[in-house]
């Protein structure tokens, strides 16, 4: 059974992940239309279901494509280089989802834009945090 300290740690990690994702979304939304238009040409894949921490596997698998889009915007609106930002997110995701069980991510048929993708994972973080508090 999860202890209060492990729950608190999970909550803090989720809050950290949430802040990183929100920072990326804010950075993207700051772009003038021409750049945003280019970023929106990238297709992202969404999980069929995202209700548990193990479903973060689906986020982990899309981090490299996310880094590619952020490379388009590398110097403008982010404090960190895309590689470092994604590396930080990857560390949190790996800790949160755990490595004990191998979960095969199932993806929805429809693709999403970067904005929809980030919003989906922001909602996921908020939802899990609310169950922990």
């Amino acid at each position: 059974a999860p202890t209060s300290s492990s729950t608190k740690k999970t909550q803090l990690q989720l809050e950290h992940l949430l802040l990183d994702l929100q920072m990326i979304l804010n950075g993207i939304n700051n772009y003038k239309n021409p750049k945003l238009t280019r970023m929106l040409t990238f297709k992202f894949y969404m999980p069929k279901k995202a209700t548990e921490l193990k479903h973060l596997q689906c986020l982990e698998e899309e981090l490299k494509p996310l880094e590619e889009v952020l490379n388009l915007a590398q110097s403008k609106n982010f404090h960190l280089r895309p590689r470092d930002l994604i590396s930080n997110i990857n560390v949190i995701v790996l800790e949160l989802k755990g490595s004990e069980t191998t979960f095969m991510c199932e993806y929805a048929d429809e693709t999403a834009t970067i904005v929809e993708f980030l919003n989906r994972w922001i909602t996921f973080c908020q939802s899990i945090i609310s169950t922990l508090t």
């Epitope: 894949y45 698998e61 494509p65 590619e68 490379n71 403008k76 993806y107």
Partner: antibody
């Protein structure tokens, strides 16, 4: 049709700089990134970096960071690659390239004819 | 950076015979969401720029003869020329286009035996 036409061959002294141009036609230069790839004589291909002509955003390979400058002039549909502090190992053919119509960044589908830069004292 | 290892360095094949070139990446190039491998193959003849043959490991570029085919997934990939023609003499390179910086293999020289 898409065409990338590069400037002519250059001979440079060690320590100097070279600026190679790449004129795009057959599409709007602001719609795609322009990449630069080099190839030393008898050697393989090495990606140097890209520029987004839309806003001048650049992304350089770590190896060339600080020595290469990519720029673009949208009014003439021309991209430029400037390499400074030249040394003999920089002797190579320099290519500009563009991605496929259907892919935002890679792979490189359209290439310039190449510009030979020779660095010799 | 992702390291691309190509083999063999050179290959001599008789006209009309099959030529096979291998490429191995240091990390998986498979994107789970779309099941695509971000690997391309190029042909380069002397004095010419590289020519895109195949991308996403197995998608032929428009106008490329169908004797050229690509296969493989994850970290192991193959370019096959089913029936070698004289005009296929060239150096062939693989390229990973999954993550920046894109990286090329060292090349495989294909000659007529």
């Amino acid at each position: 049709q898409v065409q990338l036409v590069q400037s002519g061959a250059e001979v440079k002294k060690p320590g100097s700089s070279v600026k190679v141009s790449c004129k795009a036609s057959g599409y709007s230069i602001t719609d795609y990134l322009i990449h630069w790839v080099r190839q030393a004589p008898g050697q393989g291909l090495e990606w140097m970096g890209w520029i987004d002509p839309e806003d001048g955003e650049t992304n350089y390979a770590q190896k060339f960071q600080g020595r290469v400058t990519l720029t673009a002039d949208t009014s003439t549909s021309t991209a430029y690659m400037e390499l400074s502090s030249l040394r003999s190992e920089d002797t190579a053919v320099y290519y500009c390239a563009r991605s496929l119509d259907s892919t935002p960044i890679y792979p490189f589908a359209y290439w310039g004819q190449g510009t030979l830069v020779t660095v010799s004292s | 950076d992702i390291v691309m290892t190509q083999s063999p360095d050179s290959l001599a094949v008789s006209l009309g015979e099959r030529a096979t070139i291998n490429c191995k990446s240091s990390q998986s190039l498979l994107r789970s969401g779309n099941q695509k491998n971000y690997l391309a193959w190029y042909q380069q003849k002397p004095g010419q720029p590289p020519k895109l043959l195949i991308y996403y490991a197995s998608t032929g570029q428009s106008g490329v003869p169908d004797r050229f085919s690509g296969s493989g997934s994850g970290t192991d990939f193959t370019l096959t020329i089913s029936s070698l023609q004289a005009e296929d003499v060239a150096v062939y390179y693989c390229l990973q286009h999954y993550i920046t910086p894109p990286t090329f293999g060292a090349g495989t020289k294909v000659e007529i035996k």
